[in-house]
């Protein structure tokens, strides 16, 4: 109960929650969330822990077909959707039970993607031409990474890869690249 | 940092064979599929054929099924391109590029990531 | 094969100009990109999906089309944006690109 999920037209997953999650964060940048100075140990609150691990957060599942222009996949995908607030694993699924999400008092752990996964796919058209195969990275498992507060609303960005951060407003894009321009880590990107 | 790392420039002869090597680097070259594009000197671009270096399978553009292959060695994220018997007409600028993928309520794909390019000269 | 056309061949502009390059699909496709190549290096994506600004790229660029006729626009030529600009589709196989358009200094 509480985790029912429908699916509508555009293939999107709407959890049926006594209220609704957080929209997902933007995807983990492990340059910025590994530096050093990013760390430091939180303001104490009641269910402060010592390890990040002992966190845990929602994995939603997500099906969709995947397309290219009036090409479809012959087959939907499923991937995870890494949802809402992280809170103490031992008390996160009461809450989850009870369609409330924990929210701490001291840092802001979030659920962002931690593992992908590669999947090759094949379009089939309309009017039977035969389009190319695909291939597609996939949300394979989610992780909560802990914001401190000397994470600064630019650096909340760098959650984001270069490669799906938004700019100026507009939509997530992918980073122009070459060789000789090697410029921000996409390796996140899905 | 997330790149491509081709060897380096090959001065060959006629009738040789040859086979250079594209490494990715910060990624997994299986996630994705890699190519090889062509351009001879003063010319376009030409794609030449693509790897899932997962699983080894390759397509060919028609003009270069047969003339050259393109195989994959993913334990080291690296892609090659060979040539069993070099011809003049061969000496060309030859690029590796990274196929990138995002989904945000659409699927898009790009070529995001090219190598530096390893330039091949066939002269006798 | 899905041949890509682009005119016109060369295009003589000064600085702060607005640039129209085109690209012509044999036939229809559903999405194409652009990249621009400057001497001795390696192309870079400068639009995917038609008319979407790839990262790091300047507004003065701008993609748009359907079917199997397809325009980037830079706006303003800068000094910088003097180069080769190729087209491509990446949804049949062959994948194939466009001869390209250099956009020379007047």
């Known amino acids: 109960q509480g985790w029912q999920a429908f699916k509508n037209d555009a293939t999107e997953i709407i959890p049926e929650l006594g209220e609704y999650p957080e929209p997902p964060p933007e995807l983990e940048n492990n340059k910025t969330m590994n530096r050093a100075e990013n760390g430091g140990r939180p303001p104490h609150h009641p269910f402060e822990t010592k390890d990040v691990s002992e966190y845990s957060c929602r994995e939603l599942h997500f099906t969709r077909y995947v397309t290219d222009g009036p090409c479809r996949s012959a087959k939907p995908v499923t991937e995870l959707v890494c949802s809402g607030q992280c809170g103490p694993a031992r008390l996160l699924p009461n809450a989850i039970g009870r369609g409330k999400w924990w929210r701490p008092s001291g840092p802001d752990f979030r659920c962002i993607p931690d593992r992908y996964r590669a999947q090759r796919v094949q379009l089939l058209c309309p009017g039977g031409e035969a389009p190319r195969a695909r291939k597609v990275r996939l949300v394979a498992s989610c992780k909560c990474k802990r914001l401190t507060r000397f994470h600064n609303q630019s650096e909340l960005k760098d959650f984001g890869t270069e490669a799906a951060r938004p700019q100026k407003g507009r939509k997530p894009r992918p980073r122009a690249r070459s060789a000789k321009a090697n410029q921000a880590e996409l390796e996140n990107a899905y | 940092e997330v790149q491509l790392v081709q060897s380096g420039a090959e001065v060959k002869k006629p009738g040789e064979s040859l086979k250079i090597s594209c490494k990715g680097s910060?990624?997994?070259?299986?996630?994705?599929?890699i190519h090889w594009v062509r351009q001879m000197p003063g010319k376009g671009l030409e794609w030449m054929g693509q790897i899932d270096a997962e699983d080894g399978e390759t397509e060919y553009a028609p003009r270069f099924q047969g003339q050259v292959t393109i195989s994959a060695d993913k334990s080291i994220s690296t892609a090659y391109l060979q040539w069993s018997s070099l011809k003049a007409s061969d000496t060309a600028m030859y690029y590796c590029?990274?196929?990138?993928?995002?989904?945000?309520?659409?699927?898009?794909?790009?070529?995001?990531?090219w190598g530096q390019g390893t330039t091949v000269t066939v002269s006798s | 094969e899905i041949v890509l056309t682009q005119s016109p061949a060369t295009l003589s502009l000064s600085p702060g100009e607005r640039a129209t390059l085109s690209c012509s699909a044999s036939s229809s496709v559903s999405y194409i990109h652009w990249y621009q190549q400057k001497p001795g290096q390696a192309p870079r994506l400068l639009i995917y999906s038609t008319s979407e600004l790839a990262s790091g790229i300047p507004a003065r660029f701008s993609g748009s089309g359907s079917g199997t006729d397809f325009t980037l626009t830079i706006s303003s030529l800068e000094p910088e944006d003097f180069a080769v600009y190729y087209c491509q589709q990446l949804s049949h196989l062959p994948l194939t690109f466009g001869g390209g358009t250099k956009v020379e200094i007047k």
């Open positions: 590029a990274r196929e990138g993928y995002y989904y945000d309520g659409r699927d898009y794909w790009y070529f995001d990531v």
């Open positions: 910060d990624f997994e070259i299986k996630d994705y599929y």
